[in-house]
């Protein structure tokens, strides 16, 4: 039954040049996750984690994106252009698609705090 919910790291901030973990978690469903897609604010695909085929990082992001932890994604060498929305899309059977949203703000300031909290959008 489509009873699942996506919990995400919500709104997060990180320093320019640093790294950040984007994390989504699907709960409250027995559905099997067949694939998780990670997309950037302009809808370009960053990476895919497929249950059978494993990780695929798209060429444009290979140098700055690392798979994991888990089904999450680590963005490295952050630039100001990385500010914006990120989406995790869970493709599951038999439920279909679940989608979570994370907003990342990249800050110039050296006092930028890396705040991450799980929330239901």
């Amino acid at each position: 039954m489509m009873t699942g919910t996506i919990e995400t790291t919500g709104n997060i901030s990180a320093k320019k040049g640093g790294s950040v973990i984007l994390q989504c978690h699907l709960s409250s469903t027995m559905a099997q996750v067949t694939q998780v897609n990670w997309e950037q604010h302009d809808h370009s695909l960053l990476a895919i984690r497929n249950a059978e085929l494993g990780w695929h990082i798209y060429p444009a992001f290979k140098d700055r994106v690392a798979p994991g932890p888990g089904l999450g994604l680590t963005l490295q060498s952050l630039t100001m252009n990385d500010t914006g929305e990120y989406f995790c899309t869970y493709h599951t059977y038999p439920d279909g698609t679940y989608r979570g949203r994370i907003f990342l703000e990249v800050l110039e300031s050296s006092v930028a705090e890396h705040s991450a909290r799980f929330q239901i959008p």
Epitope: M1, M2, Q32, T34, Q35, N37, I48, N50, A51, E52, L53, H91, Y93, P94, D95, G96, T97, Y98
Partner: antibody
Framework: QLQLQESGPGLVKPSETLSLTCTVS??????????WGWIRQPPGKGLEWIGS???????FYNPSFKSRVTISVDTSKNQFSLKLSSVTAADTAVYYC???????????????WGQGTLVTVSS | DIQMTQSPSTLSASVGDRVTITCRAS??????LAWYQQKPGKAPKLLIY???SLESGVPSRFSGSGSGTEFTLTISSLQPDDFATYYC?????????FGGGTKVEIK
């Protein structure tokens, strides 16, 4: 326009293996949005879901068939296949392949179907 | 498995009639119910999903309602093209299961 076409022998002997292939045209079987299923309908009876597959090979089977069914996918040919072993006369049916797709957050539905192929199990 | 029971199994009606078909699930499926139309020698066609949402391109004379275990498909004014067999299907819990069908025939 997406089209699905079943192909395979129309006659299978008891105890043998039924093999069917579904060829998808007008769209890619490799889309992450879709699952691909097999449904059958014995003559004059209702519909029965056999199982479904994802482009990457993840499979989901009806427990009623699980011990003798195999569904596989060949993305290079845009095809997926059904094998049903140890068939009996009770497996005589029209076999349909279909696409399972979402409608927003509303689960997965059989929205495109092949025209079906009749498989008779008889010696 | 969830058993889906349709009634009636056969329904005789005339063009212009209002027709109602019932589908009962053996346990709650929330609103995860679809209706399909099948004509002789053809594949089923999706009409309604999530109990009451009309599939794109399906005439508005078709409507669905219900939740939990009791569902109905209504054709507000039967047209010649509507004489067919109708199936309900639950898609909330595996394995996916269908009702036994309701044949709508000309009176």
């Amino acid at each position: 326009q997406l089209q699905l076409q079943e192909s395979g022998p129309g006659l299978v002997k008891p105890s043998e293996t039924l093999s069917l292939t579904c060829t998808v045209s007008g769209g890619s079987i490799s889309s992450s949005l879709y699952y691909w299923g097999w449904i059958r309908q014995p003559p004059g009876k209702g519909l029965e879901w056999i199982g479904s597959i994802y482009y990457s090979g993840s499979t989901f089977y009806n427990p009623s068939f699980k011990s003798r069914v195999t569904i596989s996918v060949d993305t290079s040919k845009n095809q997926f296949s059904l094998k049903l072993s140890s068939v009996t006369a009770a497996d005589t049916a029209v076999y349909y392949c279909a696409r399972e797709a979402g409608r927003g957050t509303t689960g997965l539905l059989f929205d495109y179907w092949g025209q079906g192929t009749l498989v008779t199990v008889s010696s | 498995d969830i058993q889906m029971t349709q009634s009636p199994s056969t329904l005789s009606a005339s063009v212009g009639d209002r027709v109602t078909i019932t589908c009962r699930a053996s346990q709650s499926i929330s609103s995860w119910l679809a209706w399909y139309q099948q004509k002789p020698g053809k594949a089923p066609k999706l009409l309604i999903y999530k109990a009451s949402s009309l599939e794109s391109g399906v005439p508005s004379r078709f409507s669905g309602s219900g939740s939990g275990t009791e569902f109905t498909l209504t054709i507000s004014s039967l047209q010649p093209d509507d004489f067919a067999t109708y199936y309900c299907q639950q898609y909330g819990i595996l394995p996916r299961t269908f009702g036994g069908g309701t044949k709508v025939e000309i009176k």
